[in-house]
């Protein structure tokens, strides 16, 4: 599991991984955009056994999943989607 | 061909402890997930555990967390599940279960003969 | 936790006959949804994946549909070799298994 928490330059992913998670063990997932001091796009998963995850959002995977989770933003998510908020 | 082959089930007392083996044939075991399903005698399906390609990330069903244990030794192209504390409610036929792939189309598509667990004093 | 109701529980039909069994769910669970027959001493054998993908070596008969949270399994002319059980299976968090329809000669 990699850990995932704030540095000093605001980014919270130490690490990425491109392994593919299926859609059915993961619980949400968070996009934090680049900006807000830090230079990089990020995305976390939060899983369904409780541990959490950086992905790297080039992996073609979860660009396939956020893709499949847009269009079907007009009825309710299975997978919480989360934005980072800029001040 | 694919073929899933289990093992290891047998009569246990309630309490003790018991490791189910699913030797893989067929196809790149490492490239799938894996898991396992139940199913007591008479009774519908029931998913029990899942693992991830490597063995680093393991998913369990309610009823069976701090009890089971699914690992995996791709070297051998084997799958197990570690069973301790067994109850009579765990009685079933335990399948192992090709899981996932890539794009999901072999979500529990192959599926071994099973092997027998009865718990019982 | 989603949970799948199935229907009927058991069912009694002919050879020839169009039979459905229907699948619903605690929730939406975006047709990711899968159809399996099993017969007495046999693992099961899946059908149907993703709601409407028929697995090959299938006949074509057996069809399925659905969305949202309500599915179904439809066999458009029983033959003699369809009396079995069948589990629907829903893959859009975590399992969980539909308690099976037992499909009988009448």
């Known amino acids: 599991v990699l850990e995932v928490y704030y540095t000093s330059l605001r980014c919270r992913c130490v690490q990425e991984s491109s392994v593919f998670i299926p859609r059915r063990f993961i619980d949400r997932i968070q996009i934090l955009p680049r900006g807000n001091g830090c230079p990089r796009k990020e995305i976390i998963v939060w899983k369904k056994n409780k541990s959490i995850v950086c992905v790297d959002p080039q992996a073609e995977w979860i660009q396939r999943m956020m893709e499949v989770l847009r269009k079907r933003s007009s009825s309710t998510l299975p997978v919480p989607v989360f934005k980072r908020k800029i001040p | 061909e694919v073929q899933l082959v289990e093992s290891g089930g047998g009569l246990v007392q309630p309490g003790g402890s018991l490791r189910l083996s699913c030797a893989a044939s067929?196809?790149?075991?490492?490239?799938?997930?894996m898991a396992w399903v139940r199913q007591a005698p008479g009774k519908g399906l029931e998913w029990v555990a899942s693992i991830n390609y490597d063995g680093g990330d393991t998913y369990y069903r309610d009823s069976v967390k701090g009890r089971f244990t699914i690992s995996r030794d791709n070297a051998k192209n084997s799958l197990y599940l570690q069973m301790n504390s067994l109850r009579a409610e765990d009685t079933a036929v335990y399948y192992c279960a090709t899981e996932e792939d890539y794009d999901g189309s072999y979500v529990m598509d192959a599926w071994g003969q099973g092997t027998l667990v009865t718990v019982s004093s | 936790d989603i949970q799948m109701t199935q229907s009927p529980s058991s069912l009694s039909a002919s050879v020839g006959d169009r039979v459905t069994i229907t699948c619903k769910a605690s929730?939406?669970?975006?047709?990711?949804l899968t159809w399996y027959q099993q017969k007495p001493g046999k693992a099961p054998k899946r059908l149907i994946y993703?709601?409407?993908i028929l697995q090959t070596g299938i006949p074509s008969r057996f069809s399925g549909s659905g969305s949202g949270t309500e599915y179904t399994l439809t066999i458009s002319s029983l033959q003699p070799e369809d009396f079995a059980t069948y589990f629907c299976l829903q893959q859009s968090s975590l399992y969980t298994f539909g308690q099976g329809t037992k499909l009988e000669i009448k």
């Open positions: 993703n709601t409407n």
């Open positions: 929730q939406n669970i975006n047709k990711e």
């Open positions: 067929g196809f790149t075991f490492s490239d799938y997930y």
